[in-house]
């Protein structure tokens, strides 16, 4: 089947790194220059991701692969293949419509990324605050009131910090 | 083709005024968000202002009240006029197309201008 379909298509030879030329008697072109072909058989070349402004260049072009881009530093990527750049903030700060923003009280950020989120509420787990929240860190709950008492004969180990978990990009 | 140039940089003394100007061609500008960014000498990328095609303009707080973005659609131009000059605003100063219309975030196929300097000293 492979033969049979190369004679019939000629341009089934042409290997990643060159296009079909319909202009040139299907003859196998090599892609020109800022254009590549990742797959044999290509009838056209594709242009070259070109990374600029905020995005840098991660891996060149070649004929046979495009370009990669990441982000300048102080920025980040966002979406499939960094399609994106963000701009970082602080820790305790988050990106809004007027640039980066320290966090609201009660709320804390421990990223460069991402929003500012709640602290966590420990009497909802029947805890107490062993170490107050700031911007850049949630609290640290500890033992509950009761366990905190006069007489109590041992105290409770804090529970560690929840991990907080990662804003939806 | 599609272009972007940036022109009105210069040295001016801190408190003293520049007027940047981004000419554009080769896109529909008329409906096209825009932005400026700078970069300081060996510091980041930083986003200072962007505009909607509607007008409607937002800023980095540390030049609020200091620069003013604005476009004008017949000339395919947008500009930045920035007053009460500090030597912190010494940067390359970038006009560029914005179409995530989030602040501090451009997309892959955003156009880039090649920047012009603003150095302000006395």
């Known amino acids: 089947f492979e033969r049979t379909r190369s004679l019939q298509d000629p341009c089934s030879n042409c290997p990643a790194g060159t296009f079909c030329d319909n202009n040139r008697n299907q003859i196998c072109s090599p892609c020109p220059p800022n254009s590549f072909s990742s797959a044999g058989g290509q009838r056209t070349c594709d242009i070259c991701r070109q990374c600029k402004g905020v995005f840098r260049t991660r891996k060149e072009c070649s004929s046979t692969s495009n370009a990669e881009c990441d982000c300048t530093p102080g920025f980040h990527c966002l979406g499939a293949g960094c399609s994106m750049c963000e701009q970082d903030c602080k820790q305790g700060q988050e990106l809004t419509k007027k640039g980066c923003k320290d966090c609201c009280f009660g709320t804390f950020n421990d990223q460069k990324r991402g929003i500012c989120r709640p602290w966590t509420n420990c009497s909802l787990d029947g805890k107490s605050v062993l170490v107050n929240g700031t911007k850049e860190r949630d609290v640290v709950c500890g033992p509950s009131p009761a366990d905190l008492s006069p007489g109590a004969s041992s105290v409770t180990p804090p529970a560690p910090a929840r991990e907080p978990g990662h804003s939806p990009q | 083709e599609v272009q972007l140039v940036e022109s009105g940089g210069g040295l001016v003394q801190p408190g003293g005024s520049l007027r940047l100007s981004c000419a554009v061609s080769g896109f529909t500008f008329s409906s096209s968000a825009m932005s400026w960014a700078r970069q300081a000498p060996g510091k980041e990328f930083e986003w200072v202002s962007s505009?909607?095609?509607?007008?409607?303009?937002y800023y980095v707080e540390s030049v609020k009240g200091r620069f003013t973005i604005s476009r004008d659609n017949a000339k395919n131009s947008v500009y930045l006029q920035m007053s009460s000059l500090r030597p912190e605003d010494t940067a390359v100063y970038y006009c560029?197309?914005?179409?995530?219309?989030?602040?501090?975030?451009?997309?892959?196929?955003?156009?880039w201008g090649q920047g012009t300097l603003v150095t302000v000293s006395s």
């Open positions: 560029a197309t914005w179409k995530t219309l989030r602040v501090g975030v451009w997309d892959e196929s955003d156009y």
């Open positions: 505009i909607y095609s509607s007008g409607k303009t």
